[in-house]
């Protein structure tokens, strides 16, 4: 039975040209996190494997940095980076948990963080 929940940074906004940290946290389960995939729509951005370490997709190597922790840092943001991001936690023995973050990249200097929320 899957008892865990993923807490994410929720809906966030950031300035064009700046950077943002995408962060998820899995709680309420004793399952072992074996891998976290970061995806944007259907594109794989990065993988953090508990044993193998980090892999950043070649097409994002210049603008994506691993961490902090299991999170992901997006740099040199453009308006095209606006959209949904998913953290996919592969756990043993529970299976897969998915969290969603919506990022809006703004032209202006007004970029406020949204509220945190949970996905069961």
């Amino acid at each position: 039975m899957m008892t865990g929940t993923i807490e994410t940074t929720g809906n966030i906004s950031a300035e064009k040209g700046g950077s943002i940290i995408l962060q998820c946290h899995l709680s309420s389960t004793t399952a072992q996190v074996t891998q976290v995939n970061w995806e944007q729509q259907d594109q794989l951005l990065a993988i953090c494997n508990a044993d193998l370490g980090w892999h950043i997709s070649p097409s994002f190597k210049d603008r994506v940095a691993p961490g902090p922790g299991l999170g992901l840092t997006l740099q040199s943001l453009t308006v095209n980076d606006t959209g949904e991001y998913f953290c996919i936690y592969h756990t043993y023995p529970d299976g897969t948990y998915t969290g969603r973050i919506f990022l809006e990249v703004l032209e202006s200097s007004v970029a406020e963080h949204g509220a945190r929320f949970q996905i069961p």
Epitope: N37, D51, L52, G53, H55, H90, T91, P93, T96
Partner: antibody, heavy 125, light 107 residues
Framework: QLQLQESGPGLVKPSETLSLTCTVS??????????LAWIRQPPGKGLEWIGS???????YYNPSLESRVTISVDTSKNQFSLKLSSVTAADTAVYYC?????????????????WGQGTTVTVSS | EIVMTQSPATLSVSPGERATLSCRAS??????LAWYQQKPGQAPRLLIY???TRATGIPARFSGSGSGTEFTLTISSLQSEDFAVYYC?????????FGGGTKVEIK
């Protein structure tokens, strides 16, 4: 290029423990970023993943076999091993060792990209 | 655990024809799917990973597609050496699981 070779007895008696070793050549287990796996194939049937181990000793087992399986690694000999206890005729199969994730750093995928030739184990009295 | 189901169990195709093999996951595995080819008396060989990326040395007539729960392996023009058993495998969470296989035989 990594290469794998399975070794061990071809005949095991029921209720005994099956022991197989996989020797890795062409690279060092101690510095490799990949999983070392055992997979089996009963006669005329499909593939069944038994379990995997990382060089650090992290192990992952098939839940249906977990109570009977132990996978270990000996980095000094560049080998990893499978022990399957309390065997029955249903454990008769070709046993393969394989490497999963040898291309992880470059391509980000884990799949069984390198296989041994396989060794046939028959459980019979 | 995620159950992988392959269809059909056997596919009879003439050389030069197209073969389409299906694989279904009991729940989403995103694009974490691999395809293997196995010939009699040999170990399996990795063909496709990430659902659609050909492994090193695999001919272009092999292509993979799909994501989530539905996947397809297509062999565009079957050569004599392509008659074999094909397995899909989810590479997403532990435990790793394989489909039951599809045997591609000469019609």
């Amino acid at each position: 290029q990594l290469q794998l070779q399975e070794s061990g007895p071809g005949l095991v008696k029921p209720s005994e423990t099956l022991s197989l070793t996989c020797t890795v050549s062409g690279g060092s287990i101690s510095s490799g970023s990949y999983y070392l796996a055992w997979i089996r194939q009963p006669p005329g049937k499909g593939l069944e993943w038994i379990g995997s181990i990382f060089r650090s000793g992290s192990t992952y087992y098939n839940p249906s076999l977990e109570s009977r399986v132990t996978i270990s690694v000996d980095t000094s000999k560049n080998q990893f091993s499978l022990k399957l206890s309390s065997v029955t005729a249903a454990d008769t199969a070709v046993y393969y060792c394989a490497i999963e994730g040898a291309n992880f750093k470059d391509f980000g995928y884990v799949a069984f990209d390198i296989w041994g030739q396989g060794t046939t184990v028959t459980v019979s009295s | 655990e995620i159950v992988m189901t392959q269809s059909p169990a056997t596919l009879s195709v003439s050389p030069g024809e197209r073969a389409t093999l299906s694989c279904r996951a009991s729940k989403s595995v995103s694009s974490n799917l691999a395809w293997y080819q196995q010939k009699p008396g040999q170990a399996p060989r990795l063909l496709i990973y990430f659902a659609s990326t050909r492994a090193t040395g695999i001919p272009a007539r092999f292509s993979g597609s799909g994501s989530g729960t539905e996947f397809t392996l297509t062999i565009s023009s079957l050569q004599s050496e392509d008659f074999a058993v094909y397995y899909c495998q989810q590479t997403s969470p532990w435990p790793r699981t394989f489909g039951g296989g599809t045997k591609v035989e000469i019609k």
